[in-house]
Interface confidence: low
Amino acid sequence: QPPPPPPDATCHQVRSFFQRLQPGLKWVPETPVPGSDLQVCLPKGPTCCSRKMEEKYQLTARLNMEQLLQSASMELKFLIIQNAAVFQEAFEIVVRHAKNYTNAMFKNNYPSLTPQAFEFVGEFFTDVSLYILGSDINVDDMVNELFDSLFPVIYTQLMNPGLPDSALDINECLRGARRDLKVFGNFPKLIMTQVSKSLQVTRIFLQALNLGIEVINTTDHLKFSKDCGRMLTRMWYCSYCQGLMMVKPCGGYCNVVMQGCMAGVVEIDKYWREYILSLEELVNGMYRIYDMENVLLGLFSTIHDSIQYVQKNAGKLTTTIGKLCAHSQQRQYRSAYYPEDLFIDKKVLKVAHVEHEETLSSRRRELIQKLKSFISFYSALPGYICSHSPVAENDTLCWNGQELVERYSQKAARNGMKNQFNLHELKMKGPEPVVSQIIDKLKHINQLLRTMSMPKGRVLDKNLDEEGFESGDCGDDEDECIGGSGDGMIKVKNQLRFLAELAYDLDVDDAPGNSQQATPKDNEISTFHNLGNVHSPLK
């Protein structure tokens, strides 16, 4: 082992370095002192550090560590924040266009139903937006309300346009008849199924992205313990006390310290991995009736079909409802009052579908691919931080927390540290409360994501297949068939897709650079002068 270099007889270098951290020199000894009051940088001989300096070093070390952690997560944080915003806006645009489409359908095909229809459509899509953003609304209720509201207008304007004003007090009866007589056939049920499935998935997708932001924000702003602060001080600053200004910590030693400091954070790793994989599974299933873009942009067509269905049966319906709602607002009727053969819906169901065009689904897949590159983010954090802070290459001629060594030995370092501080103890303390809370939230979202992940290769659920919907023939010239007649597949209609080029240029080059990061104590960071890696906030 080489002898330590001769100590600075005047502590001059230490004084000039420390002055960058703390203007004024009152805490720095002019010449080396015994340092018997030191608690972290325990001296083997005379030292240029005082207890006050040690405290300042500890504070600075913890601040540096927080900066390093923020720097490490910056790219990932930017990726999720940007995507959450982009997708939220994209979904809102889809809803807006779906509303425009539906209004246009009414305007072009049923002008007599406007403006009431516009009002009902507007309310429905407002609810859709609110639901996606997490509002506690029942999708079935939304769809029921839309059809309950539409039917009285359809009945009085389309089916019975000559109805005297005195008969217009039958709205409540008509609303009830709508459900009991299934006047729209199975279309409301079909819309409920499609809308609820696609919106549930959309909603949890956004929830998951927002939780991702919360996870990063939580770990980004962790306050490191005093024990960790002491370890970091010993690694980064105690060498200064001996006048070893240019010495870098040993890489292996840095890894040991970081694993100790990050022990709680690293516990997130298992749940973070599961989060990304579960999100991927969810995204892989977001197609056809699980893709809100498909479903909502095709709604105008299904609603149109449902009104045509009413018109097709208008004759029998008018007779039946005339009897049921004749002179009373009271609902005296029952489903049995209408002939059983009246509402058999043989209509082919159309689900909006587009072959693999560049739409939101490809954006989602792109996000997942980027996220997967961060799957080991938490387990790799200690190593990442060491590689982005000044450490000695090859563990040669480096600082091991006590002295300058020719080669780092983890065993020797551990033995030497036993009387000062027990690394094992730090690891055994378990994660901080905030980390435990975020782990619980990750467990919860992972469970939700798993519940929502759809079985592959199915277009509709089994229970929907059993509703009596039929695949029909592939005759309409604007329709196409997917799959054979006996495989549970259904006829689909091509739909326009918006948002093909939704701004999504989230290259890392666009991420705010370190220079833009808030560094409240820049003067404290400069301690590392030119030792920092180019990516390190410690430069």
């Epitope: 915003a85 982009v86 806006e89 994209a90 645009i93 807006r96 266009h97 246009a104 072009n108 587009v354 065009e357 560049e358 739409t359 091509n494 326009l496 897709r497 918006f498 948002l499 093909a500 080029e501 939704l502 701004a503």
Partner: antibody, heavy 123, light 105 residues
Framework: TVTLDESGGGLQLPGGALSLVCKGS????????MFWVRQAPGKGLEYVAE????????YYAPAVKGRATISRDNGQSTVRLQLNNLRAEDTGTYYC????????????????WGHGTEVIVSS | ALTQPSSVSANLGGTVKISCSGG????YGWYQQKSPGSLPVTVI????KRPSDIPSRFSGSTSGSTSTLTITGVQAEDEAVYFC???????????FGAGTTLTVL
């Protein structure tokens, strides 16, 4: 009254880049989608790019995708089209156009046009 | 692609209809250009809406995937090329027809 003034055209070298700027006035700029449409000599109109009112959504025609970037500065009421790796077929008059609202129906929803700026790509 | 006739003619004061089909989005706009390179003027947007400075003789209607521009009481100054615009697919959200030359007789 709505006015749209384009600038930045002129003679460009193949493989080079051009930057066109359109300044809008007479309307609340940030509330409307903006477009670039071009017309090659003796040809019809060709959609180039579109940007939403906030700038968060962009759309590009296949002919320019990967080479074009549309951006906007609502503070300055300007929209910019950056077109890289220029080709002879990029020659034509480039028009700036205003959408009817902040989520217009792309080429179905233009209600005002600029006078255009001529771009010639030639060596 | 959008399909429109290459040329139509109309008598002064008469009525002319120009059709355009093929827009999968079923939303159309109509744009008038009096000479190549001059600024286009929107006569109809979003299927049937007319800018305030456009005379009421211009109207638009859409049925299914076909849009029709109707000019009733054609004037000499209406002689121009009329382009329809729509969107074809998410890969090509904006598209224009090749243009229809209106000749006033």
């Amino acid at each position: 009254t709505v006015t749209l003034d384009e600038s930045g055209g002129g003679l460009q070298l193949p493989g080079g880049a051009l930057s066109l700027v359109c300044k809008g006035s007479g309307f609340t700029f940030s509330s409307f989608n903006m477009f670039w449409v071009r017309q090659a000599p003796g040809k019809g109109l060709e959609y180039v790019a579109e940007i939403s009112g906030t700038g968060s959504s962009t759309y590009y025609a296949p002919a320019v995708k990967g080479r074009a970037t549309i951006s906007r500065d609502n503070g300055q009421s300007t929209v910019r089209l950056q077109l890289n790796n220029l080709r002879a077929e990029d020659t034509g008059t480039y028009y700036c156009a205003k959408g009817v609202d902040s989520d217009s129906w792309t080429a179905a929803g233009i209600d005002a046009w600029g006078h255009g700026t001529e771009v010639i790509v030639s060596s | 692609a959008l399909t429109q006739p290459s040329s139509v003619s109309a008598n002064l004061g008469g009525t002319v209809k120009i059709s355009c089909s093929g827009g999968t989005g079923r939303w159309y706009g109509w744009y008038q250009q009096k000479s190549p390179g001059s600024l286009p003027v929107t006569v109809i947007y979003s299927n049937d809406k007319r800018p305030s400075d456009i005379p009421s003789r211009f109207s638009g209607s859409t049925s299914g995937s076909t849009s029709t521009l109707t000019i009733t009481g054609v004037q000499a100054e209406d002689e121009a090329v009329y382009f329809c615009g729509s969107r074809e697919s998410s890969r090509n959200p904006g598209i224009f027809g090749a243009g229809t030359t209106l000749t006033v007789l």
